[in-house]
């Protein structure tokens, strides 16, 4: 009689993570008597996957009833496949022996490959805010995919970015892989409403890439511009001075008025107006009693924005010796303003 052969007809099997893999194996003869075992890998370090004689195999089932005397189908199914199950599986026939069964014949092996989807990309930006014209780095990470081939692209408001570096780890063979990419983005004053998108394409996604996003509103700080102006005289001895705080983001802002270097009033921006680009405007005014001053008055609008060092704009009010003689319009004179950092 012809010697028993162990036939594994499938050289390779490709299964998606979470699905069931069927590993086929048949024997050409009932002789010699002895059990079948399935192994992953070859040599002394192989892993026993299924043992016909004994054991508990929660994820492994046999395709046919191995207890039937004339059974020659030793195929198995492995459920809930994960990337860790990838490898070459061997169906091995043992000959009954004493005290041990002896390995008799092995199949050629079936390579199980597992396709696993990448996790949703997570995009993270810098820890601290940055101002326009600065370059900031964003990172994108996705994990758990297999096979290793993967494509990652970066976009800002739909426009593809080119300044990025990507690594797929590990470099060698692995059950699953991770991708890590860092992109550099130059901020502009208009970026409050901008988005950075990381897009990952993989064979398991069937042309529908995964995307992770980051809003630049979390990253950008647009410092305000200040303008101090003197309004027409409201009464004979009063001058209304306004400080226009324009185009700032985020909203966190505190304004202090100083008269000749002494704090007059401090307030926090509350009822701001929003610009189309997402930045804010705010106005504060100060009523100055000119008659209370004998000399010229230096008014300073000092703004602390988002915890940054204060910026200020000053305005000089000239206090006239005889305001009544000069008329109400000359009670105060705008002599220009100068911007300086008073810290």
């Amino acid at each position: 009689e012809e010697e028993l052969q162990v036939i594994q007809p499938d050289k390779s099997v490709l299964v998606a993570a979470g699905e069931t893999a069927t590993l086929r194996c048949t024997a050409t003869s009932l002789i010699p008597v002895g059990p079948i075992q399935w192994f992953r890998g070859a040599g002394p370090g192989r892993e026993l996957i299924y043992n016909q004689k004994e054991g508990h195999f929660p994820r492994v089932t046999t395709v046919s009833d191995l207890t039937k005397r004339n059974n020659m189908d030793f195929s198995i199914r492995i459920g809930n496949i994960t990337p860790a199950d990838a490898g070459t599986y061997y169906c091995v026939k043992f000959r009954k022996g004493s005290p041990d069964d002896v390995e008799f014949k092995s199949g050629a092996g079936t390579e199980l490959s597992v396709r696993a989807k990448p996790s949703a990309p997570v995009v993270s930006g810098p820890a601290a805010r940055a101002t326009p014209q600065h370059t900031v780095s964003f990172t994108c990470e996705s994990h758990g995919f297999s096979p290793r081939d993967i494509t990652l692209k970066w976009f800002k408001n739909g426009n593809e970015l080119s300044d990025f570096q990507t690594n797929v780890d590990p470099v060698g063979e692995s059950v699953s892989y991770s991708i890590h990419s860092t992109a550099k983005v130059v901020l502009t004053r208009e970026d409050v409403h901008s988005q950075v998108i990381c897009e990952v394409a993989h064979v398991t996604l069937q042309g529908d890439p995964l995307r992770g996003t980051a809003n630049l509103s979390e990253t950008i700080r647009v410092p305000p511009t200040l303008e101090v102006t003197q309004q027409p005289v409201r009464a004979e001895n009063q001058v209304n001075v306004t400080c226009q705080v324009r185009k700032f983001y985020p909203q966190r802002l505190q304004l202090t008025w100083l008269e000749n270097g002494n704090v007059s009033r401090t307030e926090t921006a509350s009822t701001v107006t929003e610009n189309k680009d997402g930045t804010y405007n705010w106005m504060s005014w100060l009523l100055v009693n000119v008659s209370a001053h004998r000399d010229d008055v230096k008014l300073t609008c000092q703004v602390e924005h988002d915890g940054q060092p204060a910026v200020s704009k000053s305005h000089d009010l000239k206090v006239s010796a005889h305001p009544k003689e000069q008329g109400s319009n000359t009670a105060a004179e705008n002599t220009g303003s100068n911007e300086r950092n008073i810290y």
């Epitope: 026993l48 195999f57 994820r59």
Partner: nanobody, 124 residues
Framework: QVQLQESGGGVVQAGDSLRLSCVAS????????MGWFRQAPGKEREFVAG????????YYANSMKGRFTISRDNAKNLVYLQMNSLKPEDTAVYYC?????????????????WGQGTQVTVSS
Amino acid sequence: QVQLQESGGGVVQAGDSLRLSCVASGRTFSSLDMGWFRQAPGKEREFVAGISRSGISQYYANSMKGRFTISRDNAKNLVYLQMNSLKPEDTAVYYCAAALTFRGSDLPRDSNYWGQGTQVTVSS
């Protein structure tokens, strides 16, 4: 070289549950088949349960089937033995073992490394 350290033993009442843990170091854990054994006073060391390196196949001594469950966490280099419905005759020192090759309940012969053991006492 593989170092194994058991923990989780103690004194319990009959019918109670206990979970033993064994942490392995010194070699890639996912390349090791793992097992638990026990030795009662005056008796030989006996096989309790074994698990293959990925956890796909498990083996139990007949007297422990249904009561004991072996599992592993390859990310944490840990193997566990969950023991339910404990009996006074389960009193023993429980040993963790690691094998480079694994042939089911032939594990005692194949174990290359052993822990120091943890005492489990079940009182009636």
